[in-house]
Interface confidence: medium
C-alpha cells in the first residue's frame, strides 16, 4: 500500500464508553491533527474509512457496518454505536484518503461494565464546587448530538445509588442539577440518566462526575507563612545540622499555581555553592485549602552559613508574601578551669 | 430451553445458589433475568445479566442477590434468605435486541421451589 | 422509584364478553411494555411486547395499545381459556427499579 501519513495511537484520546449505551465517537483526524475539517475534505472527494483492531489482537479488520439494527454505523466524521456491546473494545482507526493524500490515526475506544449503583472503572471528571457559595448547578456531560432538539428525554439524577427526590439543598432540573448551598456534605458521585426513544427504540446515556465542595472565593486569602515566625530562633553551633521549616496555608483558589521557595542570601538554592537539601511536603484540608511545608537542610552548618540570611516566599493567585527565618550562631559559654599558678607548687 | 434447578427447603440465614441451565440459546446474545414469585402473590423481578456480562438488580435485592453467568449457566447467589423468600424462582430469557427487548421475557423456565422455614 | 400500577386486580366477564386492563407507569416508559398470561401452577407466558405487539402464537383476540404511561389490554370474545392473571411489565429502564412488574389482574371467565 502506498504511503500514509500515520498519526501512530492517539492515547492522549483514551475514550471510555458504557456498555449497552449508544456512544458517538469523532475521528480525532479533524480535531487535532489536520487543520481542515470534514466538510471541507469530503468536498474535496477525500474518503473517511474506519476499521479497527480486536482487544489482545494484532490483526486490523473492516468494521461491520450491517450489523442487525445499525447496531454500528458511519455519519460524516462520527463512528456510531447503538448502542455498544463489551467487545466492541479495541483500536479504532480512522483514514481520509484519495489517490494522492492519505492521513490517519488510531484511538483506544473501552467499553465498560457499570453496576446498578453506576459503579465502574471509568474516570470520572471531577466538578468542584464552592462551599456555602449560594446557588451553583452542574451539567449532565456529553450528551450533544445523540438527539435533536424536537426530543425531549427523560433525564433522572442519582447520587451514589439514590435518585434525587426531596434532598434538602440539591435539585434536580432537567439537564441540570441545581445546589442551593454546598456544603461538604454533597461531595460524591452524582449520575445522570438520559433516556431518549429514537427509530421506535429507548436509549439510556450514563454520565457520572464527583462533586467536590472547596474553599470558597469568598473566604480566600494570601499565602499565610505559619513558618519560620518571630518567636524561633534557630541558634546552632557549627558541624551540627540546621533544619528549618516553611511552612505555608494557601486558601483553596481555582486554577491557582501555589508556589513555596527558599533564598538564601537573597539567591536559590540551586544558584550558590552550599550543600543544602530541601525537601516538600503537602497535605489537603477537606475543602482544598494547602499546607505546603519545606524543609531547608544543611548537614554540616558553617559560622559563615549562620551568617546568611534565610528567606521563606510564597505565592499564590491571592499574593506573594516572604518570611526571614531568625539563624544565629550558638555562643560558647564560658569554661571554668582550674588553671595551676606560680607560687603553688611543692617544695 | 431453560430450566432451573436448587430449589430446596432452607433455614432462615443458610445461603443458596440456584442455577439456571440453557440449551440452544447463545447466553453471549442473550439477557437473561431472575424473577420470583412468592405463593399467591405477583411476579417481582430480582435483577438480570445483559449479554456482555453486566448485572441489573432491584432496589430491594442489591447486596443479597448476586447474578453471574457462564457459556450455559447462569447462577442466582442467595444471602441471609429469611422467610419472605420462599418463592418459585424463574429464570427467564429477554427477547433479542438492544435496551428494553431485554426486558421482554420470551422463554421462561418451570421454576424452582425455594421454601425457607425454622 | 418506578412503580408500574395496574388495575383492575380482578375482573369476571362472562364468555364471549370484553376485558380491559389498565396499566399505569410512574414515568414515561415510551412503548416498552410487555404483557404476560400465567395460568395456576403454570410458567408465565408472554401475550404481547412493544405495547401493541403480538407474540408468536397469541390469538387475535388479545391487543395491547398506548405509550407513554398508559397502557390497555383487551381481550375481545374472551374464551374460557383465557381465565388466568395477566401482568403487565416494563422494559424501558432498570435503573432505580422495585419491581418492573404490575401487581396482576386475575380474569374470571363465567
Known amino acids: 500500500s502506498e504511503r500514509c501519513d500515520d498519526w501512530g495511537l492517539d492515547t492522549m484520546r483514551q475514550i471510555q464508553v458504557f456498555e449497552d449505551e449508544p456512544a458517538r465517537i469523532k475521528c480525532p483526524l479533524f480535531e487535532h491533527f489536520l487543520k481542515f475539517n470534514y466538510s471541507t475534505a469530503h468536498s474535496a472527494g477525500l474518503t473517511l474509512i474506519w476499521y479497527w483492531t480486536r482487544q489482545d489482537r494484532d490483526l486490523e479488520e473492516p468494521i461491520n457496518f450491517r450489523l442487525p439494527e445499525n447496531r454500528i454505523s458511519k455519519e460524516k466524521d462520527v463512528l456510531w454505536f447503538r448502542p455498544t456491546l463489551l467487545n466492541d473494545t479495541g483500536n479504532y482507526t480512522c483514514m481520509l484518503r484519495n489517490t494522492t493524500y492519505c492521513s490517519k490515526v488510531a484511538f483506544p475506544l473501552e467499553v465498560v461494565q457499570k453496576d446498578s449503583c453506576f459503579n465502574s472503572p471509568m474516570k470520572l471528571p471531577v466538578h468542584k464546587l464552592y462551599i456555602e457559595y449560594g446557588i451553583q448547578r452542574i451539567t449532565c456531560p456529553n450528551v450533544d448530538g445523540y438527539f435533536p432538539s424536537s426530543v425531549k428525554p427523560t433525564i433522572t439524577w442519582y447520587m451514589g445509588c439514590y435518585k434525587i427526590q426531596n434532598f434538602n439543598n440539591v435539585i434536580p432540573e432537567g439537564m441540570n442539577l441545581s445546589f442551593l448551598i454546598a456544603l461538604i456534605s454533597n461531595n460524591g458521585n452524582y449520575t445522570c440518566v438520559v433516556t431518549y426513544p429514537e427509530n421506535g427504540r429507548t436509549f439510556h446515556l450514563t454520565r457520572t462526575l464527583t462533586v467536590k465542595v472547596v474553599g470558597s472565593p469568598k473566604n480566600a486569602v494570601p499565602p499565610v507563612i505559619h513558618s519560620p515566625n518571630d518567636h524561633v530562633v534557630y541558634e546552632k553551633e557549627p558541624g551540627e545540622e540546621l533544619l528549618i521549616p516553611c511552612t505555608v496555608y494557601f486558601s483553596f483558589l481555582m486554577d491557582s499555581r501555589n508556589e513555596v521557595w527558599w533564598t538564601i542570601d537573597g539567591k536559590k538554592p540551586d544558584d550558590i555553592t552550599i550543600d543544602v537539601t530541601i525537601n516538600e511536603s503537602i497535605s489537603h484540608s477537606r475543602t482544598e485549602d494547602e499546607t505546603r511545608t519545606q524543609i531547608l537542610s544543611i548537614k554540616k552548618v558553617t559560622s559563615e552559613d549562620l551568617k546568611r540570611s534565610y528567606v521563606c516566599h510564597a505565592r499564590s493567585a491571592k499574593g506573594e508574601v516572604a518570611k526571614a527565618a531568625k539563624v544565629k550562631q550558638k555562643v560558647p559559654a564560658p569554661r571554668y578551669t582550674v588553671e595551676l599558678a606560680c607560687g603553688f607548687g611543692a617544695t | 430451553s431453560v430450566e432451573e434447578s436448587g430449589g430446596r427447603l432452607v433455614t432462615p440465614g443458610t445461603p443458596l445458589t440456584l442455577t439456571c441451565t440453557v440449551s440452544g440459546i447463545d447466553l453471549s446474545n442473550y439477557a437473561m433475568s431472575w424473577v420470583r414469585q412468592a405463593p399467591g402473590k405477583g411476579l417481582e423481578w430480582i435483577g438480570s445479566?445483559?449479554?456482555?456480562?453486566s448485572t441489573y438488580y432491584a432496589t430491594w435485592a442489591r447486596g443479597r442477590f448476586t447474578i453471574s453467568k457462564s457459556s450455559t449457566t447462569v447462577d442466582l447467589k442467595m444471602t441471609s434468605l429469611t422467610t419472605e423468600d420462599t418463592a418459585t424462582y424463574f429464570c427467564a430469557r429477554g427477547c433479542p435486541g438492544y435496551n428494553g427487548d431485554k426486558y421482554t421475557f420470551d422463554l421462561w423456565g418451570p421454576g424452582t421451589l425455594v421454601t425457607v422455614s425454622s | 422509584a418506578f412503580e408500574m400500577t395496574q388495575t383492575p386486580s380482578s375482573v369476571s366477564e362472562p364468555v364471549g364478553g370484553t376485558v380491559t386492563i389498565k396499566c399505569q407507569a410512574s414515568q414515561s416508559i415510551y412503548n416498552y411494555l410487555s404483557w404476560y398470561q400465567q395460568k395456576p401452577g403454570q410458567r408465565p407466558k408472554l401475550l404481547i411486547y412493544?405495547?401493541?405487539t403480538l407474540a408468536s402464537g397469541v390469538p387475535s383476540r388479545f391487543k395491547g395499545s398506548g405509550s407513554g404511561t398508559e397502557f390497555t389490554l383487551t381481550i375481545s370474545g374472551v374464551e374460557s381459556a383465557d381465565a388466568a392473571t395477566y401482568y403487565c411489565q416494563q422494559g424501558a429502564t432498570s435503573y432505580d427499579i422495585e419491581n418492573p412488574f404490575g401487581g396482576g389482574t386475575e380474569v374470571v371467565v363465567k
Open positions: 412493544r405495547a401493541s
Open positions: 445479566v445483559i449479554s456482555g456480562g
